[in-house]
């Protein structure tokens, strides 16, 4: 709001000073030169003087302005300043300084801070097919890594695109060996909501971040295909007769979200027992993973059958495809 | 440059359309709302109509413009559009579309790409065992990812800890779909130098990087263990009789550097034919990888034996361990 000042028995309205800048193209690229346009508006007609500063140093004195235009009682004009892209990108601050009736009015600007700051990353994981379809307790995890420790706490908030309510979930912080902080928040979701295409958003704010980091997650689009499961046992080796390796190839599934489990004597083995590769594309259509499990003689002597099970949304009727293998077939 | 058009015997000069945007403050923070100002200048006076689009969708039709100002023969006006910060930060594209004398003129803009993109990273790879021991033409690769495109070039320089000279290697730049640049430099090394423990350094400098990125690489220390190789074929499936998948498990090797190849009829198949997982730790000591190869009926009918070969520094006598598999054993 403009105030009206009384000076030496003359009333006047001082200018509002606002810098606009040339915009990036529709690929988000900076132009080779940056134009700054200083809009000087809403002042009682009178002499003005414009000076442009770079990091507080005078760059352009008595910068020319076009004849002022008038709207009612008040005048407006503008001043332009052009600078090289490299100076703008090096985070220099530019000030448009307007002198009017013996007083200085100004506005300052610099390149907008990177909206996705380097180093700090946020990730949002989809629920596992096992949690979605079998245990019916799906969760999604928001993970923030590489934060510098500070007095201020990180704030993670969840929301849903549908606007439906989301419970408040406390985040857990963990200091890493390299001195950075990792922050995690786990949100329970409802299987039906996920299947119906709800979008979940995790928003991360912290005083040291130039702006919030926002990550969204919804179910994968695209065609669906059930996995094929094949399981193999390595042959006996002289030097390690009491240990064998089982390999499970799970392939041609779409989308890439899959849960892999091993069962022995009708009991699911702990996930830590086996190692699963990241889903990778097949040469045709779909993804594949391998899982590797080391088993002991004590286990196969108790029961010589191990099952590799894949849980996937396209597997029917019960989201499960599995295959059994014997370590010593025919014995 | 404005052109002059002749339409039904009337000459006119069409408008230049340029979007300016409200600037960030001197801390680089985005304002809560973003003002876009569409400058429509240098046209022969006449009716104009302004429409604002967001991601190609009409947002504001017949957007009001103040009375045109005239400079000589030509007129200028402007149109304003205000949007929420969150829409600007979500990388939507905004277009000012000006209709004049039955023709459309426009300018589009979006948030500028991050100039110091998150996670500018440099990686230095070790030479592959195949290149080191078999083809005897080892190289190491320095890879820089997630750079923002700019006029200035990235500078990658190589050096050796021994101080011995290093050839000048030109770097290659590739623009990625997400708008970032990937820069690669490949340095040939001498097998003997590598084996004897020479350290190689890649130094990356660029005006937009706050400081140089430096990466060093030397051969892995620690114990050595040769790989075990096991290879399996998936059984025939009714729906895909003319295609089978071969799986190769290579395990218990140390260090993790390994090359995997497939051979058929004594010929090495192109690397692009198969997919190898990243080395992962076994539960005991050592690493494992899987390789997956799809083979066709035409291939196995020509010769029904495929070989999976691992090249590793601990494999003796010739750095190679391999295993054969038949698709149709006993047929």
């Amino acid at each position: 709001v403009n105030k009206t000042f009384g000076v030496s028995s003359r009333n006047f309205t001082p200018p509002t000073v606002k810098i606009l800048q040339s915009s990036c193209d529709d690929d988000g690229h900076f132009p080779p030169t940056i134009q700054l346009l200083c809009l000087i508006s809403g002042y009682t007609p009178g002499a003005i003087n414009v000076t442009w500063l770079e990091n507080g140093q005078v760059m352009k004195v008595n910068s020319p302005t076009p004849p002022a235009t008038q709207e009612g009682e008040l005048a407006s004009t503008q001043s332009e300043f052009t600078l090289a892209q490299k100076h703008w990108l090096s985070d220099r601050t530019y000030t448009c300084q307007v002198t009017y009736q013996g007083t200085t009015y100004n506005d300052s600007t610099k390149k907008c801070a990177d909206s996705n700051p380097r180093g700090v990353s946020a990730y949002l994981s989809r629920p596992s097919p096992f949690d979605l379809f079998i245990s019916k307790s799906p969760t999604i995890t928001c993970l923030v890594v590489d934060l510098a420790p500070s007095k201020e706490t990180v704030n993670l908030t969840w929301s849903r695109a549908s606007g439906k309510p989301v419970p408040h979930i406390p985040a857990t912080e963990k200091k890493q060996r390299n001195g950075t902080l990792t922050v995690t928040s786990i949100l329970p979701v409802v299987t039906q909501d996920w299947i119906e295409g709800e979008t979940y958003q995790c928003r991360v704010t912290h005083p040291h971040l130039p702006r919030a980091l926002v990550r969204s997650m919804t179910k994968t689009s695209g065609p669906r295909a059930a996995p094929e499961v094949y399981v193999f046992a390595t042959p006996e080796k002289l030097e390690s007769r009491d240990k064998r390796t089982l390999a499970c190839l799970i392939q041609n599934f779409m989308p890439e979200d899959i849960s892999v489990q091993w069962l022995h004597s009708d009991v699911q083995l702990p996930d830590a027992r086996h190692s699963v590769t990241q889903p990778r594309k097949t040469k045709g259509s779909g993804f594949f993973v391998f899982s590797r499990l080391e088993v002991t003689k004590a286990e196969w002597e108790q029961k010589d059958e191990f099952i590799c099970r894949a849980v996937h949304e396209a597997a029917s009727p019960s989201w499960i495809v599995q295959q059994a293998v014997s370590v010593n077939p025919g014995k | 440059v404005n052109k002059t058009f002749g339409v039904s015997s009337r000459n006119f000069t069409p408008p230049t359309v340029k979007i300016l945007q409200s600037s960030c403050d001197d801390d680089g923070h985005f304002p809560p709302t973003i003002q876009l100002l569409c400058l429509i200048s240098g046209y022969t006076p006449g009716a104009i109509n302004v429409t604002w689009l967001e991601n190609g969708q009409v947002m504001k039709v017949n957007s009001p413009t103040p009375p045109a100002t005239q400079e000589g023969e030509l007129a200028s006006t402007q149109s304003e559009f205000t949007l929420a910060q969150k829409h600007w930060l979500s990388d939507r594209t905004y277009t000012c579309q000006v209709t004049y004398q039955g023709t459309t003129y426009n300018d589009s803009t979006k948030k500028c790409a991050d100039s110091n993109p998150r996670g500018v990273s440099a990686y230095l790879s070790r030479p592959s065992p195949f290149d080191l021991f078999i083809s005897k033409s080892p190289t190491i690769t320095c890879l820089v990812v997630d750079l923002a495109p700019s006029k200035e070039t990235v500078n990658l320089t190589w050096s050796r800890a021994s101080g011995k000279p290093v050839p000048h290697i030109p770097a290659t730049e590739k623009k990625q779909r997400n708008g970032t640049l990937t820069v690669t430099s490949i340095l040939p090394v001498v097998t003997q130098d590598w084996i004897e423990g020479e350290t190689y350094q890649c130094r990356v400098t660029h005006p937009h990087l706050p400081r140089a990125l430096v990466r060093s690489m030397t051969k892995t220390s620690g114990p050595r263990a040769a790989p075990e190789v096991y290879v399996f074929a998936t059984p025939e499936k009714l729906e895909s009789r003319d295609k089978r998948t071969l799986a190769c498990l290579i395990q218990n090797f140390m260090p993790e550097d390994i090359s995997v190849q497939w051979l058929h009829s004594d010929v090495q198949l192109p690397d692009a034919r198969h997919s190898v997982t990243q080395p992962r730790k076994t539960k005991g000591s050592g690493f494992f990888v899987f390789s997956r190869l799809e083979v066709t009926k035409a291939e196995w009918e020509q010769k029904d034996e495929f070989i999976c070969r691992a090249v590793h520094e601990a494999a003796s006598p010739s750095w190679i361990v391999q295993q054969a598999v038949s698709v149709n054993p006993g047929k």
Partner: nanobody, 122 residues
Framework: EVQLVESGGGLVQPGGSLRLSCVAS????????MSWVRQAPGKRPEWVSA????????YYADSVKGRFTISRDNAKNTLYLQMNSLKPEDTAVYYC???????????????YGQGTQVTVSS
């Protein structure tokens, strides 16, 4: 963020025509190859057609050759599939797809749209 939005599907009689569109955003559309993939109920996905980044090279599955035409308008960030002489076996959900690397043939793509249903029935 890469986004692909298909439209133009619907119910059509055998022998009829449809034109599918796919509007892309979030990437430099004109720099990337694009494909159409379809999935019939209870079947595995099937690659239909592809076009290179500039639009000069097109590729088709044998099942649609001579009936379907793929095209693109890079100025509008839009991919098209003109489907003529439609048959009941063309009934499927049609997806527009693209990939960071290879998108000119059967593949598992990095990005798909939500799909548009095409039903060919009398």
């Amino acid at each position: 963020e890469v986004q692909l939005v298909e439209s133009g599907g619907g119910l059509v009689q055998p022998g009829g025509s449809l034109r599918l569109s796919c509007v892309a955003s979030g990437f430099t559309f004109g720099s990337y190859d694009m494909s159409w993939v379809r999935q019939a109920p209870g079947k595995r996905p099937e690659w239909v057609s592809a076009i290179n980044s500039g639009g000069g090279s097109t590729y088709y599955a044998d099942s649609v050759k001579g009936r379907f035409t793929i095209s693109r308008d890079n100025a509008k960030n839009t991919l098209y599939l003109q489907m003529n002489s439609l048959k009941p076996e063309d009934t499927a959900v049609y997806y527009c797809a693209t990939d960071e690397d290879y998108a000119l043939g059967p593949n598992e793509y990095d990005y798909y749209g939500q799909g548009t249903q095409v039903t060919v029935s009398s």
